[in-house]
Interface confidence: medium
Amino acid sequence: KSPIFGPEEVNSVEGNSVSITCYYPPTSVNRHTRKYWCRQGARGGCITLISSEGYVSSKYAGRANLTNFPENGTFVVNIAQLSQDDSGRYKCGLGINSRGLSFDVSLEVSQGPGLLNDTKVYTVDLGRTVTINCPFKTENAQKRKSLYKQIGLYPVLVIDSSGYVNPNYTGRIRLDIQGTGQLLFSVVINQLRLSDAGQYLCQAGDDSNSNKKNADLQVLKPEPELVYEDLRGSVTFHCALGPEVANVAKFLCRQSSGENCDVVVNTLGKRAPAFEGRILLNPQDKDGSFSVVITGLRKEDAGRYLCGAHSDGQLQEGSPIQAWQLFVNEESTIPRSPTVVKGVAGGSVAVLCPYNRKESKSIKYWCLWEGAQNGRCPLLVDSEGWVKAQYEGRLSLLEEPGNGTFTVILNQLTSRDAGFYWCLTNGDTLWRTTVEIKIIEGEPNLKVPGNVTAVLGETLKVPCHFPCKFSSYEKYWCKWNNTGCQALPSQDEGPSKAFVNCDENSRLVSLTLNLVTRADEGWYWCGVKQGHFYGETAAVYVAVEERKAAGSRDVSLAKADAAPDEKVLDSGFREIENKAIQDPRLFAEEKAVADTRDQADGSRASVDSGSSEEQGGSSR
């Protein structure tokens, strides 16, 4: 499929001008190659009318130009003094006309309306309101006022001052007669439909002395705004419908076959299943405007989108609307990354998040998508040191591996962690990618004790058991803090006895804390990695207390203080089911500072959308 994109249809009237924008992927080659606009012939060829290399056909001399905007990845063709002869099929493209790097555009130039003398032209957008003003003379002040619509050869009564309303206009038309001082009546038609367009006649009086005024009503279907976004990227639709619909339900829909427009999301709580986990509807402002963000763009998201306002929360005749034509560029600059990551209860996941490598200094964020109401994505962690209170000790955002990818590690998983998460940065490109975490059946691979108590001034040794599947991985211990996890020295103590059916390649790696101080209290992680790519982690909370008798502590899996959520295994080792067991002393001062975000933590459900791009939580 060609990555060139432009308007499928362009409509104009004789004598007017058009401006046609064509989009292309802004690669170095594309930015500098020839741009052209050509007319398709009946036998298949395409005759160049204008190009970026300076050529202008005699048909376009003095009335057209082509301008390239390489920094935007667009070029614009302007054509003036249109005639009906300009109607036809065209291509805008790059390179050589016959190479296929092009987009088909249909240009339709119609004859201007043949208007009667003294005709007032009203041009109004679909779904909006028009007020047709009708002046009259004093002698007709007390006489019947009426509005007719010309249907073929015959005028058809639309409304009059005796109370008649044509059934096609019921509930959306009124006739206002101004105060005695003003010799004017007006007809207000709202929720305008395309079928309302045409010639109208307003009349005061019914005899030969009646006052008449002609009006031509043109109802404009909104021209779709072209939107060009990368596959796997995101798009934001800004919808400004005006204050008159501020209190009416809003919707975004996608046009399918014919006139159908399937609701993508609306303010009444409806959301299409295909957009679960990757859409937010930003609530409207007082002026009736709102925006919709869609992330993780797919090929099938391409198409025409309409936003509108209607009490039903869906497109109806007479809804005020705005339109976009979304093109999803498959030659995306956004690299593939797993869209589903799987982990087990008590285990961990390491999520890889892409970002624009030109924006390595940008701040990285990770938020949790929640579907309630119009969707929201509360922040969980950022690369600057902010971590949501409930995630302290089990969530970390690492700049590694760098060069266009960062890593988010979440451990002590429970079923409540299943759901959709967004990776994003504050860079100019505003990349947003979506990943779904699924919690599957299974046991965590790494085995550590439950919460551990260390004694001030003594030595503490904490074991971590790695199964043989991680024999080729680097094994590490680190101390968690809100800016990451600082590596600590650890000792390989040889094969582990914690695994059944596991050979000598299993490993017991211990963390040793010498001369324990109060500063040693906190969360410690053991984990595996390959270079800068992280695998599984397991977390242990170390509490520090005073003890009278001296000595050192060597904590085995069986010796650590039993916690209610732990199971004692037959082998004498214990595994943590782990509901983020926190020592009550942890961050006591900080806990007193209420984080308003934490109070809005709704339940989260996992939606299995099925994906071919899945990654397990245990390894890369």
Partner: nanobody
Amino acid sequence: EVQLVESGGGLAQAGGSLRLSCTASGTISKIDVMAWYRQTPGNERELVARIFSNDVTHYVDSAKGRFTLSRAQDKNTVDLQMNSLEPDDAAVYYCNAQIWSDMRGRMDTYWGQGTLVTVSS
């Protein structure tokens, strides 16, 4: 919209002190990060210090031990106490506020107009 107003800039002797203050007003629900950045002619803006909504503070190396960030009870005013000033501290200091939008899934960033700090040796 959020407006940030800085005050407290001016001239100080090397080794002396200055206190910068920044107040946020407008449609504020909760500020996630308030920070001070500085910029010297021909250079990019650089971070000096910042405070998060959970009251964790972060200082760049050159500010550690000399500068102190504090926040008012309402969390919408942040002060930067600068002690032991050095000629290299001379710059335009900008207040920065960041507010995470759950509904847009992004961090919105706001800047003050800047206040000039001059350090004479």
